[in-house]
């Protein structure tokens, strides 16, 4: 079988129940693979720790929006 079929995917068992300060966050990625038990957002903190969060929670959505704005290239 091709490697891609058996390649593991990163998933989340559960979500943090603590809101993370946006100042501690460096980036995020969405987890939408059908191989995972649930959809999730994985935040990477400024110290490179990865934390699973619930994409349905408002603070998670707000944090993603904030990170998106941070990474947008300023218009010249």
């Amino acid at each position: 079988q091709p490697d891609a079929i058996n390649a593991p995917v990163t998933c989340c068992y559960n979500f943090t129940n603590r809101k993370i300060s946006v100042q501690r966050l460096a980036s995020y990625r969405r987890i939408t693979s059908s191989k995972c038990p649930k959809e999730a957002v994985i935040f990477k903190t400024i110290v490179a720790k990865e934390i699973c969060a619930d994409p349905k929670q408002k603070w998670v959505q707000d944090s993603m929006d904030h990170l998106d704005k941070q990474t947008q290239t300023p218009k010249t």
Partner: nanobody, 126 residues
Framework: EVQLVESGGGLVQAGGSLRLSCAAS????????IAWFRQAPGKEREVVSC????????YYADSVKGRFTISSDNAKNTVFLQMNSLKPEDTAVYYC???????????????????WGQGTQVTVSS
């Protein structure tokens, strides 16, 4: 070919017992943990129990602690989930999966998910 095959599901009355089996083939059993998940209609999959094949360490969700017991027969590449004192809320499709590690205290840390089985239906009637 990698395969995870669940069996042992069925219909049981509340208070009864079932023993689920997850037979694995096509990969080196000792390199993975095996987790049992369940999914009830209209709900997300949740992890129920997990066992690390390498050291035998186990995990149980709070909702099944004291009622479910996970074990493995490494020689037969099979993991068992003994389910006692079943409740109607245990009704779900139960799936086993090969994963990188079982949940820890910090179970909001990501893990690697390799393969799912097809699932076995467990129905607990009141």
């Amino acid at each position: 070919e990698v395969q995870l095959v669940e069996s042992g599901g069925g219909l049981v009355q509340a208070g009864g017992s079932l023993r689920l089996s997850c037979a694995a083939s096509g990969f080196t059993f000792d390199d993975y943990a095996i987790a049992w998940f369940r999914q009830a209609p209209g709900k997300e999959r949740e992890v129920v129990s997990c066992i690390s094949s390498s050291d035998g360490s186990t995990y149980y969700a709070d909702s099944v602690k004291g009622r479910f017991t996970i074990s493995s027969d490494n020689a037969k590449n099979t993991v068992f989930l003994q389910m006692n004192s079943l409740k109607p809320e245990d009704t779900a499709v139960y799936y086993c999966a090969a994963v990188s590690n079982c949940p820890r205290d910090s179970d909001y840390i990501p893990y690697l998910h390799y393969w799912w089985g097809q699932g076995t239906q467990v129905t607990v009637s009141s």
